[in-house]
């Protein structure tokens, strides 16, 4: 696709005559017709296969034609073509006389031709104008012409389409031969590929616009050459994404388990000795007088209640001392000076001699315990009642007071709420965790199906022949009151026309 441009420069018709030699009156008001066509060895006026164009009246007799291209005018004349320029052409330029304003051929005088020129030859596409001058006995025409490609067409014959663009489909301008020339920062056959930031890692980085470096998953850094360790990796590094290679002294999946806790945290207090004992674990060996995981507690040796049989403990510099109650002795008051003769067993406990009377043991009745049966047993401490039942101590035994819906010694049995048939009018009962639910038959509603819901049996218009319908609320049925001339439960039979029976 291109344009043949013809620039008319000067026309000389000094005598102001037509081609026939007849003078124009008052002068030759001259306009031009241009016919561009395929190459002909002998140019004939036939069809203008490449196009035709006419000018307005440009002057009278002799005149120069001003270049009017900048003002959007008609010089140079434009003859566009939408095919591959063949490199050869024929051109006919006619000068005509128009006495009036109507330039149509049929409106011209029959001898309106002033001059005609016909040229043919080769013409390559290019910016340079070819200057030519044609002279006859009566006239002279000076003009120049060239062929240029239309916008977006390039090449020797304007056959290469190239439209500069700067969008998703490409970022380029067009070279004179129609090849693409990528805009700065773009590459590829159609200049669709951005050139990433210099140094951006070839595999791990990419970009959607020039001088950018976007990292693929697992990579980071300005040039996407640093791997991202496993999410949550605390004291570790990576050589490929999502790794967590632990630093020295750390372990575990996330390198967050301290294998050298003693050094990193010094957890043992009060001069205790620390020993690493695995991932994030350690053992403190306390100095005398200290206790606790980290030996943080000063040790009171009475804290372990070492004194038996009601002996009282006294802390001492080098340990403790038990003050025994009457009848007891020993380091921990563990030896009794009492015997069964002293009746040491309370609450009806039975005394049994031991070690040839040097010792005794009490056998306690139910509900009592202790070495002297001095403690009462609380039978409710083990919460024996199920389903929220309340435990009550009743002398030697206990009992459970159950919540509604439960029964049994320990309220372990669920009482069926449906057992007493609570749903009225044939409703179906369903046991639920927190009660019951009734599904009511048609015509009843309410929590226990106790409410009668009347059904309008007339709603379906069962009566024929404009009979009046009544609902029987006791049976939920309908009654049809027939108009004169009709009988039947639905007033469907006319009187005198009994139904036709098959017999």
């Amino acid at each position: 696709s291109g344009v043949f441009q013809l620039q008319l420069q000067e026309f000389i018709n000094e005598r102001g005559v037509l081609a026939s030699g007849r003078p124009c009156e008052p002068g030759c008001r001259t306009f031009f017709r241009v016919c561009l066509k395929h190459f002909q060895a002998v140019v004939s006026p036939g069809p203008c296969t490449f196009g035709t164009v006419s000018t307005p009246v440009l002057g009278t007799n002799s005149f120069a034609v001003r270049d009017d291209s900048s003002g959007g005018g008609r010089n140079p004349l434009q003859l566009p073509f939408n095919f591959t320029w063949p490199g050869t052409f024929s051109l006919i330029i006619e000068a005509w006389h128009a006495p009036g304003d109507d330039l149509r051929p049929e409106a011209l005088p029959p001898d309106a031709l002033i001059s005609k020129i016909a040229i043919q030859g080769s013409l390559a596409v290019g910016q340079n104008w070819l200057l030519d001058e044609q002279t006859s006995t009566l006239t002279r025409l000076r003009y120049s012409y060239r062929v240029i490609c239309s916008d977006n067409y390039y090449g020797d014959n304007c056959s290469r389409l190239c439209k500069k663009r700067n969008d998703h489909f490409g970022h380029y301008v067009c070279q004179p031969d129609g090849n693409l020339s990528c805009l700065p920062g773009w590459t590829g056959e159609y200049c669709q590929q951005p050139i990433c930031l210099s140094g951006c890692h070839e595999q791990n980085g990419y970009c959607s616009k020039p001088a950018e470096c976007l990292c693929r998953p697992g990579w980071q850094g300005r040039l996407c050459n640093e791997c991202i360790p496993h999410n949550g990796c605390r004291h570790g590094t990576c050589s490929t994404p999502w790794q967590c290679t632990c630093d020295e002294g750390w372990g575990g999946l996330f390198c967050d388990q301290d294998l050298n806790y003693c050094t990193h945290h010094s957890p043992c207090k009060n001069g205790a000795t620390c020993s690493n004992s695995g991932q994030r674990s350690y053992t403190c060996t306390c100095r005398p007088g200290y206790t606790g995981v980290d030996c943080e507690l000063e040790l009171s040796e009475c804290d372990s209640n070492p004194c038996r049989n009601g002996g009282s403990c006294k802390d001492q510099e080098d340990g403790y001392h038990c003050l025994c109650p009457p009848g007891y002795y020993g380091l921990h008051c563990e030896h009794s000076t009492l015997s069964c003769a002293d009746s040491p067993c309370f609450n009806g406990g039975s005394c049994r001699e031991r070690n040839q009377g040097a010792n005794y043991a009490c056998e306690c009745p139910p509900n009592f315990t202790g070495s002297n049966c001095e403690k009462k047993v609380d039978r409710c401490t083990s919460n024996p009642c199920a389903n929220g039942g309340q435990c009550l101590n009743r002398g030697p035994s206990r009992m459970c007071r159950c919540r509604p819906g439960f029964t049994g010694t320990y309220c372990e049995l669920h009482v069926s709420d449906c057992a007493r048939n609570p749903c009225a009018h044939g409703g179906t009962c369903h046991d639920l965790e927190n009660g019951l639910m009734c599904t009511c038959p048609a015509g009843f509603s309410g929590r226990r199906c106790e409410v009668r819901t009347s059904i309008d049996a007339c709603a379906s218009s069962p009566c024929f022949n404009r009979a009046t319908c009544y609902t029987d609320l006791s049976t939920d049925t309908f009654v049809c009151n027939c108009p004169y001339g009709f009988v039947g439960s639905r007033c469907e039979f006319p009187v005198g026309l009994p139904p036709s029976f098959p017999w």
């Epitope: 049929e106 029959p110 005609k116």
Partner: antibody
Amino acid sequence: EVQLVESGGGLVKSGGSLRLSCAASGFTFRSHWMSWVRQAPGKGLEWVAIISYDGSNKYSADSVKGRFTISRDNSKNTLYLQLNSLRAEDTAVYYCAKAGGGNVGFDIWGQGTMVTVSS
Amino acid sequence: SYELTQPPSVSVSPGQTASITCSADELGTQYVSWYQQKPGQSPVLVIYQDATRPSGIPERFSGSNSGNTATLTISGTQAMDEADYYCQAWDRSGVVFGGGTKLTVL
């Protein structure tokens, strides 16, 4: 149908007069130049006169100048040729022809009317 | 006065090409028309503006004009093409016809 029909021809004595008419139909008569062309028996075509579409411009051959007058009535779609001072050499078939604008030539011709000048 | 010169007669065999010339000084600067006239009939325009055929004229009729000579060419001449042919141009006085050429199809 585009048509030109001449009339008014006949036998006339030398020095006499005739008025030829040409009735046009099938085209816009008032928009076209019209002409008269004659052909003597056994001879070639000879142009006689031509008139512009509005009658403002008239041209005639040197051989008939001052004797023949071309005119037109656009309201009647009719072309005329007034022949005065007729001579024997004016004997010919007179054709009425429509002239195409812009050097197209004469694209419509009538059937002709015979003018015979006797001495 | 301007004169258009034609040969009085041209003969051609059927199917052959006939060429009729029309000469005058610098005729190529003008547009030439050609007319066919058969005996007893009015002339008919067959070529105008050197080489253009009016509608209805067969393609075997063509024309050219350059220098001092215009040419009417009838290719594949048929018996029905036998007629008188006239060229026509303009001079300062008005319309000019050539003397005519009788085409005979043998």
